[in-house]
Every structure is written in C-alpha cells, then in structure tokens.
C-alpha cells in the first residue's frame, strides 16, 4: 500500500503567441481546482475509462478576479498535495490524466458552474520511494507545471511497495527465510503480500500479488472448492484430470464470515460485511484499534483507543463500509433529475443538465409554467422540462403573441383559395366543391354530398369557416 502524490506548481499561459484569455472576470470571479486520474500500465485508455489506480480532487483555489486589460497570469492554486492512495502494489508504469477545472462564482442560476479548462495526459515509469519527478505539460495555450512521486506506507517498502518490513523480534537476526530490510538494517523483511483477497486458508504466493491455490481449491482468490469425485455434468463428463468442477456449494454456504459478519456473493467469490471492531477478508482480524489504521481511503478513525472498545470509521464522501473500503457509485443513484448526465469527479458529483433545466441536480425546471403567461387567452401546458402555450384561435408562437396566419396550413381542400378573415378564415372553393373547407364534391345533377349547402349559398361561393 502507498500514496501517489501530485504537487501542482503553476497553471497559466504557455510560452509563445496566442496567450489565452483569463478564465475569470470581474463579472464572473472564479477559482481553480484539479482532478487527477491514475491507471496502471502504459495503455492509451480513453479519458472516460475507470481510474483503476485511483483518483483525487484538490481543494478549491483562492477566488480570482481578472484585472481588466491585464494578460492572464499564472492563476492562484489550491493549497496542498493531491493524494491518491493505492492499496495494492505500485505498478511501476502508469498513465495519468490531470484536469484543470474552473468554478465560476457568479450569481447565475444553479449556483457555481464548473467547466473543464484543460486536460493533460501522459504515461510514465516511476519507482515507489524515489525522489519527486518534475514535469511540464501543455494543453492548448495553457501550461501546467507539476511534480509527482509514489511513496509506500509503512510497513511496506520497495519499488512496488510489496515488501513488508517489521522491527526485528530478536536483536541479531531475522526469522527463517527472511532477509534484513535494506536500507533499514534494524528491520526484517516480512512475508510476501499476496493478491488482495487471496484466501489465507486455501491460497499462497511465491511472487507479490499472485494467488496460487492449494489442492482442492480454485478461482482467482482460491475460494471456490473443487469436487474431485467422478461425476457427469449435464454437458457430459469433465475432461479435468482431477475429476470435475460441480456447481457445489455457493461461496456463502456455511457463512465464511467470522465474528458475525454477513456474507454476500460476488461474481467471482464472496464479500464479508464486518461488524465494527473486525475486518479482513473473513472478518477474522479483531482487536483492532485506531492505531492500526483500519479506515481506508482517507476515512477518519474515532474511538477504539484499546482493543476492547470498537472503533468507528467516518468515511469521506464517495466511500462506505465499516472500514470505508467500498467506493460508492454515486451516479448509480441517478441523482441528476430530469434526464441530466451524471459525472462523478472523484470527491464531487456534477450534473450536466438538459436544456430547460438547471441547478446542482438539474432540479430547477426553467421552462415550467410558474410565472409564465401565455398572451391573448392562451393557456400554459407544462411537461417534461418544456412549457408550451396552447393558443386561442388566431394566435400562435411560443407565447401566443403572434397573430397566426389561418391560411398557413392550407386548410382549403381541392384547390380552394384561402382568405384570412378577422374571425377566422374563408375558403373560396374551386368549381365542383363546396363546404367550409371545400371538402365536399358537388354532384353533377346539382345535388351535393352531405352536408347540404346552406340555403342561398351556391357551390363556388366563399365558405366562411368560423
């Protein structure tokens, strides 16, 4: 386990022509914050792919207001490091994305608006425990200067944070098969760290991060029992030399969670939710105090001064579980109302709202009927983030303020000519047709199809449509 640390030194216009405009103004003061996303390996992954090594969000920087006419200087930065804790081995090679975000502090509807100013990405090799590495990256006209390092959290040491060092139990030598920990010669190397979650009963490792199974067990974490009795499956006999794999007991059968932990099946194995005071894969680790650092992901440990009193982890936003070990997928709650798009920026949640909505969670329906009047006797109809006016006859437009052209829809059938009239429209029908919309043919014998023409009105006379 360890921490990747990022120190931003400056963010401002890069060298050369075309200096960017300041992102802040007297009318719209703003402040910056940064987000870092880490992924293992050197793969060119899409920016949207998960930050498998972790992500972090900085604090907000000081509020900045542009001096009119002045060029954009280096912008004021947030205090402190961005820290991304990692629980397993440091991969040695990693990809990073560093985003510079602007938070506008104007009085616009929906409170502070966020926008991405710049995004830089790169792929690097880095050994844990080494010195700070300095870097300069450019994104358009902006330049970002920063340093980074990876450091192991005691008792882990080494370039991958996979070796554990403990104080010597005897003054002269380390235990069988264990070497002194260079450069800490007064400490001894502890056993290897297997893959996280590797079964302590049924798995072992010879290399850091691996999980090899004892006979009779299988699965990536050696938690799935193998049945060795000969058997027939619905698909015929298994070709495995050790017999066959049967559905067998489920991973939670017999409840592998100790100390009152509750078991839930996962796609590959099981997961224990431990009561306070216990943790570990099977809730088997007890007598934990805050001094043992049981709270992961920056959780704050309270109580638990001695092994008999339970500790409580107060988890930071985005994490849950009795040890803050589980990342909350806050977007799965669909917090963005009215069709808004959810973005989980690490320690902050952002909603990108559909047109017609605003607010931190798109809860503000800008186009509802409240306070909106439809002119000329129109009535407001709202729904789904849009309001529309149902206009009285002779009016149209968004707010019924426009005089409608009653002839625009070509209401007169069979070639009849339309005339606008103060009370509606009038159709002058072509020979052989009659009716308010010239919809009825006139029979050759002079009798018309239903309905009959009103008395005194000959076919071909204008028909007023009221």
């Amino acid at each position: 386990a360890g921490v990747f640390e990022l120190q931003i030194h400056s963010f401002g216009p890069g060298p050369g022509p075309g200096a960017p405009r300041s992102p802040c103004s007297a009318r719209l003061p703003c402040r910056l914050f940064f987000r870092v996303c880490l992924k293992p390996g050197l793969s060119e992954e899409a920016a949207e792919s998960p930050c498998a090594l972790g992500a972090a969000l900085s604090a907000r920087g000081p509020v900045y207001t542009e001096q009119p006419g002045a060029p954009a200087p280096d912008l004021p930065l947030p205090d402190g490091l961005l820290q991304v804790p990692f629980r397993d081995a440091w991969p040695g090679t990693f990809s990073f994305i560093i985003e510079t975000w602007r938070e506008e502090l104007g009085d616009q509807i929906g409170g502070p608006a966020w926008s991405l100013l710049a995004r830089v990405a790169g792929r690097r090799r880095l050994a844990a425990g080494g010195p700070w590495a300095r870097d300069i990256q450019r994104a358009g006209a902006w330049e970002l200067r920063f340093s980074y390092r990876a450091r192991c959290e005691p008792p882990a040491v080494g370039t991958a944070c996979t070796r554990l060092c403990r104080p010597r139990s005897a003054p002269s030598r380390c235990g069988p098969g264990l070497r002194p920990c260079a450069p800490l010669e007064d400490e001894c190397e502890a056993p290897l760290v297997c893959r996280a979650g590797c079964s302590p009963e049924h798995g072992f490792c010879e290399q850091p991060g691996e999980c090899r199974c004892l006979e009779g067990w299988t699965g990536p974490l050696c938690t799935v029992p193998v049945s060795t009795s000969s058997c027939l499956s619905p698909r015929g006999p298994s070709s495995a030399t050790t017999g066959c794999l049967v559905p067998g007991p489920g991973p939670c059968d017999g409840n592998p969670c100790a100390n009152g932990g509750s078991c839930s099946e996962t796609p590959r194995s099981f997961e224990c939710t431990c009561p306070r005071g216990f943790y570990g894969l099977r809730c088997e680790v007890s007598g934990v105090t805050c001094a043992d650092g049981p709270c992961f992901n920056g959780g704050l440990c309270v109580g638990g001064a001695d092994p008999d009193s339970a500790y409580i982890c107060h988890c930071p936003p985005g994490f849950q579980g009795s040890n803050c070990e589980k990342r909350v997928d806050r977007c799965s709650l669909q917090p963005c109302r009215n069709g808004g798009l959810c973005l989980d920026l690490g320690h902050a949640l952002r909603c990108r709202c559909r047109a017609g909505f605003a607010g931190p969670r798109c809860e503000h329906d800008l186009d509802d009927c409240a306070g909106r009047a439809c002119a000329n006797g129109g009535t407001c109809v709202e729904g789904g983030g849009a309001h529309r006016c149902s206009c009285a006859l002779g009016f149209g437009g968004r707010d019924c303020r426009e005089r409608a052209d009653p002839c625009a829809a070509r209401p007169c059938a069979h070639g009849g000519r339309c005339y606008a009239h103060f009370s509606g429209l009038v159709c002058a029908c072509a020979p052989g047709y009659m009716g308010a919309r010239c919809e009825f043919p006139v029979h050759p014998d002079g009798a018309s199809a239903l309905p009959a023409a009103p008395p005194g009105l000959r076919p071909g006379d204008p028909q007023r449509y009221l």
């Epitope: 929906g110 409170g111 709650l333 917090p335 009215n338 969670r361 809860e363 503000h364 329906d365």
Partner: antibody
Framework: EVQLVESGGGLVQPGGSLRLSCAAS????????IHWVRQAPGKGLEWVAY????????YYADTVKGRFTISRDNAKNSLYLQMNSLRAEDTAVYYC??????????????WGQGTTVTVSS | DIQMTQSPSSLSASVGDRVTITCRAS??????LNWYQQKPGGAVKLLIY???RLHSGVPSRFSGSGSGTDYTLTISSLQPEDFATYYC?????????FGGGTKVEIK
C-alpha cells in the same frame, strides 16, 4: 448529535419585517444545504426556501419570492431568513432543516423544533 | 409545480395493525420521494428517503415502495409511538412540495 435551533419568531404587523435565525451544531455546517419549511396553524408542511452548502445557490417558493431572503454564515454555523412585506398568510411555525450531503436526494434529514411567526394587526 | 396527493387524510388503527399510506405525484418524480413523521409536539423526523431507503435510527417496521407517480409508506406492525401525522415530499423538481399529510389515530 445534529442540532438545529431556530429563533427570532414573534408577533409582527402586516407589511413588517422579521429575521429568523437557525443555529446549527453537531455536524460540519459548511458541507450541507439547509431548508426553511413552515407550517400554518392546523395545516401541512410547506417548503419555503433553500440555500446550498457554500451559499451560492438559493431557491424560494413562489409564495415568498421577492419578499424573503435566505442566507448563511458558515463561520458562525448560522442560517438566516429575512422576511419582509409580511402578510397574514405568512403566519406559521418556521422550521430549519438540514439537507442531505451533496443534495443527491433533496431530503430534509434533521429538523429544528421551530419558531412561531404571527402576522396580525 | 408538482402536486403531491396523499391518501387517506386520516385513518384509525390499532397497535399491531399493518398501515399503508399512499402518495401520488402529478408527474413522474423518478423515485425522489421522502417520507416524514410529525408528532403532536411539532417535531419532524425523516423516515424514508429515495422511496425505500430507511433513514438511520428508523425502525425496520417502516418501509417504502413505488415508482413513477405512485408511492407507498407501510408500517408493518403499528406501535404506540407511531401515532402521528405522516407527510410525503418530492425531491425531483423545484419547488419541493409536500403531500397534505395523513393523520394516524388510535382506534
């Protein structure tokens, strides 16, 4: 323990003004949005106003828009409701209530005991 | 505005009874529905948020369900301390609106 304590209620004449306060303790005040909700005598609950954790966003019910102003002082863990141009129909018990963290659900998870505002000549 | 219609407006029940209160929204509120309890003294407590999630410290006899426009609060076995008025509230679209309330009285 989360605690919200309202104060500032009283008797006021129509057209008058009143400023309600809400003192918060037992949680990180600056992390939470806060609501004002009122209840007229013998009636149900009516949402009045909301202010976001940083104070940048505020919302009002149409019935009080333009007359009431919600504000907060995070340094003092205090919330305020300035009520101007008061009407008889503003007579109610006024509660302050804490919003949920990050306003994912727009709940009001902890409430004060309320302060009574009476508008009468 | 989204109108919230609660029913019944009052009901009489005995200790141990199963009680169901319904709340109907005038349009889809996508599960952003919260339930509150108000005791005669005036104190208001959040019971359930996001349709079915129990607020911390709320007994498991309270449960919620629903989607779209129709939502339900159920008390599986009414206890003496449950006699109170219950309100639903939508948290989907401004302005936040409450139902008219349901008073649960002793039979």
């Amino acid at each position: 323990e989360v605690q919200l304590v309202e104060s500032g209620g009283g008797l006021v004449q129509p057209g008058g003004s009143l400023r309600l306060s809400c003192a918060a303790s037992g949680f990180t005040f600056s992390d939470y949005g806060i609501h004002w909700v009122r209840q007229a005598p013998g009636k149900g609950l009516e949402w009045v106003a909301y202010i976001s954790s940083g104070g940048y966003t505020s919302y009002y019910a149409d019935t009080v828009k333009g007359r009431f102003t919600i504000s907060r002082d995070n340094a003092k863990n205090s919330l305020y409701l300035q009520m101007n141009s008061l009407r008889a129909e503003d007579t109610a018990v006024y509660y302050c209530a804490r919003g949920d963290y990050e306003d994912i659900f727009y709940t009001m998870d902890y409430w004060g005991q309320g302060t009574t505002v009476t508008v009468s000549s | 505005d989204i109108q919230m219609t609660q029913s019944p407006s009052s009901l009489s029940a005995s200790v141990g009874d199963r009680v169901t209160i319904t709340c109907r929204a005038s349009r889809d509120i996508t599960k952003f529905l919260n339930w509150y309890q108000q005791k005669p003294g005036g104190a208001v407590k959040l019971l359930i948020y996001y349709t079915s999630r129990l607020h911390s410290g709320v007994p498991s006899r309270f449960s919620g369900s629903g989607s779209g426009t129709d939502y339900t609060l159920t008390i599986s076995s009414l206890q003496p301390e449950d006699f109170a008025t219950y309100y639903c509230q939508q948290g989907n679209t401004l302005p936040w609106t409450f139902g008219g309330g349901t008073k649960v009285e002793i039979k």
